[in-house]
Interface confidence: low
């Protein structure tokens, strides 16, 4: 099943998100990813826990899942590089580089996301985008063509309340409000966008949502600047 | 303990085709990919392609894409390299490899298949 | 393709000896995709190197590897007669995965 946590969206504008990816296994949507440079895509490491014995692939260019676009393309992945301290029981270090099996053809519908380097946190209160083909209902309903909302981000005091994460959000970790809008199931991997920056990957931990006291959790990419350009280097 | 069977020496007349097997066991079949590689007396190893054995799909080098046809079984944990148009070019040793997406380097070696293509 | 280019092609060491192996790339690689293999007559490639710097399981210390880029070499501290055996660079940063052209140890 897919992994990972859009509530309260609504259908993003066609293939005006060029660096976001599609995670699949068997053919199957499992996570988003975002394309980071043009042979490597950003996920959750914990979307290839169910890949144990599957075919996983990436998905560009695409807005629906089912319908032939021009600009789509399904690359073999030749190489899955989860962060060596992601373990399955935590969402600490909850990232994954996929090498393609060749360099993506750029184009307007395919295209990387500049990354945020600066390890700082990002503003509360600043408006996000967080975009996949996650669950759209709480039936599990699931989109075919791309979703998105818009998110205030959540200061870390508020996210690690006792009634909200209890102190499980680290520097490492940022949070979105989640009330009744969400990132939800399927949109694992996928990127949180700040003034045209990644800031950060939709956790794939199992959390409630839509519910404000259970904000959505996102690996902040800046603090793992080091990891990613080692492993794109 | 993961083993990489390979089936027996084989000589064979130009122009012919053989298929060689490679069975697999101490580990999951379908969690790894099956690389092929040969080696020509006294020369280096040379990528022909690669197999993902849960779906089946491939990939070759170039100049290997008309020459070998890459398959498995998975019910035996067997794979399985035909090469056709045999000619004296193609005599070599071949070995399977296990590596792939859970594991980027080639791992575990088969003893490889000695194949002698003469008239 | 990338090509790989070992130096040198054949050489000849004394026990207690150090041995530097070098492996060029034709265009430059990530670090993590770069591997070292070793042969002994007669029998299959074994990985000896992984990752630039990684020894594989049961592999001596005496073995080091390091590089980046387009330059990498695997060195030996103190020749032993066991080490004799061709070395092979590999990469896996693309399709397809190539091999160097080998280097040929030998012990005097």
């Known amino acids: 099943p897919p992994r990972g946590r859009i509530l309260g969206g609504r259908e993003a504008e066609a293939h005006a998100r060029p660096y976001m990816a599609s995670v699949q296994l068997n053919g199957a949507h499992l996570c988003g990813g975002v394309l980071v440079a043009e042979q490597w895509v950003l996920s959750a490491a914990h979307c290839l826990e169910d890949a144990a014995d599957g075919k996983v692939q990436v998905l560009l260019g695409a807005h629906s899942l089912s319908q032939p676009e021009p600009s789509k393309r399904l690359y073999d992945v030749l190489r899955a590089v989860p962060h060596p301290d992601s373990q399955p029981d935590t969402i600490d270090h909850d990232l994954l580089l996929l090498q393609l099996s060749e360099k993506a053809t750029l184009g307007p519908a395919v295209r990387p996301l500049p990354w945020q380097r600066v390890d700082r946190d990002v503003a509360p209160g600043t408006l996000c985008d967080v975009a996949g083909w996650g669950i759209v209902n709480h039936a599990g309903r699931r989109p075919d063509s791309l979703q998105h909302v818009l998110l205030p981000v959540l200061d870390r005091a508020t996210c690690n309340r006792r009634t909200h994460h209890d102190g499980a959000i680290t520097e490492r970790l940022m949070c979105a409000e989640s009330n009744r809008r969400d990132s939800c199931k399927g949109d694992s991997g996928g990127p949180l966008v700040c003034g045209g920056v990644l800031e950060g990957v939709v956790t794939s931990g199992s959390r409630v949502c839509g519910n404000r006291k259970k904000p959505g959790i996102y690996t902040r990419v800046a603090s793992y600047a080091a990891w990613i350009d080692s492993v794109l280097a | 303990e993961v083993q990489l069977q390979q089936s027996g020496p084989v000589l064979v007349k130009p122009g012919a085709s053989v298929t060689m097997s490679c069975k697999a066991s101490g580990y999951t079949f379908t969690e790894y990919y099956m690389n092929w590689v040969k080696q020509s007396h006294g020369k280096s190893l040379d990528w022909i392609g690669v197999?993902?054995?849960?779906?089946?799909?491939?990939s070759y080098k170039q100049k290997f894409k008309d020459k070998a046809t890459l398959t498995v079984d998975k019910s035996s944990s067997t794979a399985y390299m035909e090469l056709n148009g045999l000619t004296s070019e193609d005599s070599a040793v071949y070995f399977c490899?296990?590596?792939?997406?859970?594991?980027?380097?080639?791992?575990?070696w088969g003893q490889g298949t000695t194949l002698t293509v003469s008239s | 393709e990338i090509v790989l280019t070992q130096s040198p092609a054949l050489m000849t060491a004394s026990p207690g000896e150090k041995v530097t192996i070098t492996c060029s790339v034709s265009?430059?690689?990530?670090?993590?995709?770069l591997h070292w293999y070793q042969q002994k007559s007669g029998t299959s490639p074994k990985p000896w190197i992984f990752?630039?710097?990684n020894l594989a399981s049961g592999v001596p210390v005496r073995f080091s590897g390091s590089g980046s880029g387009t330059s990498y070499s695997l060195t030996i501290s103190n020749m032993e007669a066991e080490d004799a055996a061709t070395y092979y660079c590999?990469?896996?940063?693309?399709?397809?995965?190539?091999f160097g052209t080998g280097t040929k140890l030998e012990i005097k």
């Open positions: 590999q990469q896996w940063n693309s399709y397809p995965f190539t």
């Open positions: 197999i993902n054995p849960y779906s089946g799909g491939t």
């Open positions: 265009s430059s690689i990530s670090s993590t995709n």
């Open positions: 990752g630039t710097s």
């Open positions: 490899v296990r590596g792939g997406l859970r594991r980027n380097y080639f791992d575990y």
